[in-house]
């Protein structure tokens, strides 16, 4: 069997000659040189050499625990001569001993910590970690304790933990806001002897609201033309903050003055300014100075910090409004007018009215846009902005005609405005009715009395307000000894029936049917209109088979007998 | 490098002794056992024998003990073979063999000895 | 005495082709995860040559298309892709017990 222990060795070992480790030992080992030891494993043959005689270990470098602490290597002992091993292949371990070699390491060179402004003492900062490659399990070696070198009276640290913690009070960012600490760590427990390193901690103060915004000035003042549109910036003002961030962000109200409901102010999120923006029309006429008081407010204040005042401040803006010639001003934003389809030219429709809004009063003439009445349909009395038909109208070819009516400032002809006129032609009855379609129907010679061939129907251009009522009849030289009858059926269609049994195509093979047609408006208007019958040929169902085309060439007229 | 150099080719009448060389260099003699192995003319290989320098303690195939001796000169770092009573049966290629934990790792250029009336 | 057994006696194979060589010992020849069993390799007119040592390890300088196999009684000594200069007669042997045996060896040859 094997005879050996585990075998222990020093780390960092400077001796000049190979460093003695254990010796390996078979209890069939004779001592005759019968059997060679063969080391395998870790290092073996290059940091641990074996006598192949003797079974003696030797390290031949220098070992460093930190690197690696324990090496596992494994043993044989073989008959010289047959290659047999005389015992089993075991392993054994080579432990190495610690020294206190290594000093703490910080995780980082440098750390970057922040802590708010006016903190309490003892509020944390940060933790640093130094860790020392040393064995933990033995001695002193890695047992790290931390100090600050630099740093105080500002900061401390825990000498156990490495936790940084403010140590003065109502330290001010805007006063100073970057600080750098040195701690150190040192093993041994910080005992005399032991090894030492350092790192350096940038802490930088963030930023808390303990400062109110304040104007540079107590009173604005700022000018802007009449004209200015709603949302037109006037003006800019700006609060100055000693914080930063969202603590120095500002919003601007306004609080009072006459212009509270003319006025608006808008906060500048880019460059924290309060915009003066116009809310309403302004007018120079009415009112020629505003004053407001705008009030710079933090939206973010920090209750602990109320004690110090409010985080507000507030100035005072003037605002001159100044004069500007303004065009005429129409009564209205747009006129309707109405006129009836068979007006006279020079028919006056109606009329509009501008007026110049400035003090002066300027008088205006007016003008039709012929862009817009290219016709020239229409005309404007350029002095009293009476408006007259120039040509006939007819409503049914159009209903509604839109125009533009331009008001100029006579005295100066660059200011003009402009309004739109819609003018609605109304109705009158002076078209007839007239059949939908043009009708053409038979009748089989068989027929019999009474049988509806056909209906009619009937259109009016015209749009009468209560509706379309027309009546129907055969034309007065037709009415006697027709062949056909109109019947009307009061819903604005008529039908037209047979008025014998049977009909011979042989002796007539088409019929022309003259029917009146009248509007019941005023004046009665009315149309006659021809419906060609042809005589055919029928099955027993009443289907036509064939009939003469002769119909189709005849004059349009009363034919004999119909 | 490794070297064994033998002695040349015998020939030897029935009956006779032959005695065969084998010097070794490029390591060191005594560390390392010495072996004899022979090969018949067509035939396998057949260990005889071998020897430890060191302690010249020896170790001889059953077929071969009282035929054989096998010795060493340390100084020459030469070892020896010796068959005696030779017979037509021992022709054969003689081979020395350096031993290292059972293998035969050099092997010498062999050693032709005929046995014949 | 532990009598080794090569199969087969000769064997033809293709250039680039596997040769497996077998030897079976008459009793184990392995003690403590070691197998005391080498492989030789002899060419024409040539003393014999160490291919593989233990079993399974790869004596110096020798190329690796050749490996060794086995424990107990039963190994096997491959050449994984045959070249012109394998040609040769190849032996196994012993060193577990005296007297240190041979196989009778395997010719290799191509096909």
């Known amino acids: 069997s094997w005879m050996w222990n585990q075998f222990f060795l020093l780390e960092e070992y400077t001796g000049s000659d190979y460093q003695y480790v254990g010796k390996l030992h078979s209890d069939q080992d004779r001592g005759d040189g019968s059997l060679k030891y063969i080391l395998s494993g870790d290092g073996a043959g290059d940091l641990f050499i074996i006598n192949e005689n003797t079974g003696d270990i030797q390290a031949t470098k220098r070992l460093d625990r930190e690197e690696k602490p324990v090496y596992i290597l494994r043993a044989q002992a073989i008959n010289r001569r047959t290659g047999r091993p005389v015992e089993p292949e075991s392993e054994f371990i080579i432990k190495i001993h610690d020294i206190n070699d290594n000093e703490p390491i910080f995780t980082k060179e440098v750390y970057t910590a922040t802590v708010p402004e006016m903190s309490d003492v003892g509020t944390f900062v940060v933790q640093v970690t130094a860790t020392d490659a040393d064995d933990p399990t033995y001695g002193n070696s890695a047992k790290v304790v931390y100090s600050i070198l630099q740093g105080q009276p500002y900061f401390s640290v825990e000498s156990e933990t490495g936790i940084i913690k403010t140590a003065l009070l109502n330290m001010d960012r805007e006063n100073r806001e970057q600080y750098q600490v040195v701690i150190q760590a040192k093993d041994m427990g910080g005992q005399m002897g032991g090894l030492s390193g350092t790192t350096t901690v940038n802490i930088t103060l963030t930023d808390v609201n303990d400062n109110p915004p304040r104007f540079p000035q107590s009173t604005y003042q700022f000018k802007t033309p009449e004209s200015s549109p709603p949302g037109t910036p006037i003006g800019r003002i700006k609060a100055s903050d000693a914080d930063v961030g969202e603590n120095a962000e500002i919003e601007y109200s306004i609080t009072d003055g006459e212009g509270l409901d003319m006025f608006d102010v808008i906060t500048d999120q880019e460059t924290q300014e309060g915009i003066i923006t116009v809310k309403k029309l302004l007018d120079f006429e009415k009112k020629k100075v505003y004053t407001l008081k705008v009030e710079a407010s933090n939206p973010y204040v920090e209750p602990r910090f109320l004690y110090l005042g409010p985080f507000k401040d507030s100035a005072t803006v003037r605002i001159v409004v100044e004069d500007v010639d303004e065009p005429p001003v129409f009564s209205k934003l747009a006129y309707i007018l109405q006129i009836r389809e068979d007006a006279q030219i020079n028919t006056t429709i109606g009329s509009v009215t501008a007026q110049d809004p400035d003090a002066a009063r300027n008088p205006v003439k007016y003008s039709v846009d012929r862009h817009t009445d290219m016709d020239r349909i229409f005309n404007i009395d350029s002095g009293n902005g009476s408006i007259f038909t120039s040509k006939l109208l007819d409503r049914e070819t159009l209903l509604w005609h839109n125009i533009t009516v331009i008001a100029t400032e006579i005295n100066n002809p660059k200011q003009s405005s402009r309004v739109p006129l819609y003018i609605k032609v109304l109705d009158v009855n002076d078209n007839a009715p007239e059949f939908a379609e043009f009708y053409e129907t038979f009748v089989c010679e068989k027929a019999k009395a009474d049988q509806l061939i056909q209906t009619l129907h009937a259109v009016d251009k015209d749009d009468p307000y209560s509706g379309h009522q027309f009546s129907f009849s055969l034309a007065p030289e037709a009415a006697s000894g027709s062949n056909f009858t109109i019947q009307d059926n009061k819903d604005n269609t008529a039908g037209i029936l047979t008025r014998k049994n049977g009909y011979n195509r042989h002796e007539m093979s088409t019929y022309l049917l003259p029917v009146v047609i009248s509007d019941n408006d005023y004046p009665v208007q009315s149309s006659t209109g021809t419906v060609t019958v042809r005589v055919c040929a029928c099955d027993h169902h009443g289907n036509m088979q064939s009939c003469h085309a002769e119909a189709l060439i005849h004059p349009t007229g009363l034919s004999t007998g119909a | 490098e490794v070297q064994l150099v033998q002695s040349g080719a015998e020939v030897k009448k029935p009956g006779s002794s032959v005695k065969v060389s084998c010097k070794a260099s490029g390591y060191t003699f005594s560390n390392y056992w010495m072996h004899w192995v022979r090969q018949a003319p067509g035939q396998g290989l057949e260990w005889m024998g071998d020897i430890d320098p060191s302690h010249s303690e020896t170790h001889y195939t059953q077929k071969f003990k009282d035929r054989v001796t096998i010795t060493v000169d340390k100084s020459t770092s030469t070892a020896y073979m010796e068959l005696s009573s030779l017979r037509s049966e021992d022709t054969a290629v003689y081979y020395c063999?350096?031993?290292?934990?059972?293998?035969?790792?050099?092997w010498g250029q062999g050693t032709t000895v005929t046995v014949s009336s | 005495d532990i009598v080794m057994t090569q199969s087969p006696d000769s064997l033809a194979v293709s250039l680039g082709e596997r040769a497996t060589i077998n030897c079976r010992a008459s009793?184990?020849?392995?003690?403590?995860?070691?197998?005391?069993m080498h492989w030789y390799q002899q060419k024409s007119g040539q003393p014999p040559k160490l291919l593989i040592y233990?079993?399974?390890n790869l004596e110096s300088g020798v190329p690796d298309r050749f490996s060794g196999s086995g424990s107990e009684t039963d190994f096997t000594l491959t050449i994984s892709s045959l070249q012109a200069e394998d040609v040769a007669v190849y032996y196994c042997q012993q060193s577990f017990e005296d007297p240190w045996t041979f196989g009778g060896g395997t010719k290799v040859e191509i096909k």
């Open positions: 063999a350096r031993g290292d934990l059972g293998r035969f790792d050099y």
């Open positions: 233990a079993a399974s």
């Open positions: 009793e184990s020849v392995s003690i403590h995860g070691t197998h005391l």
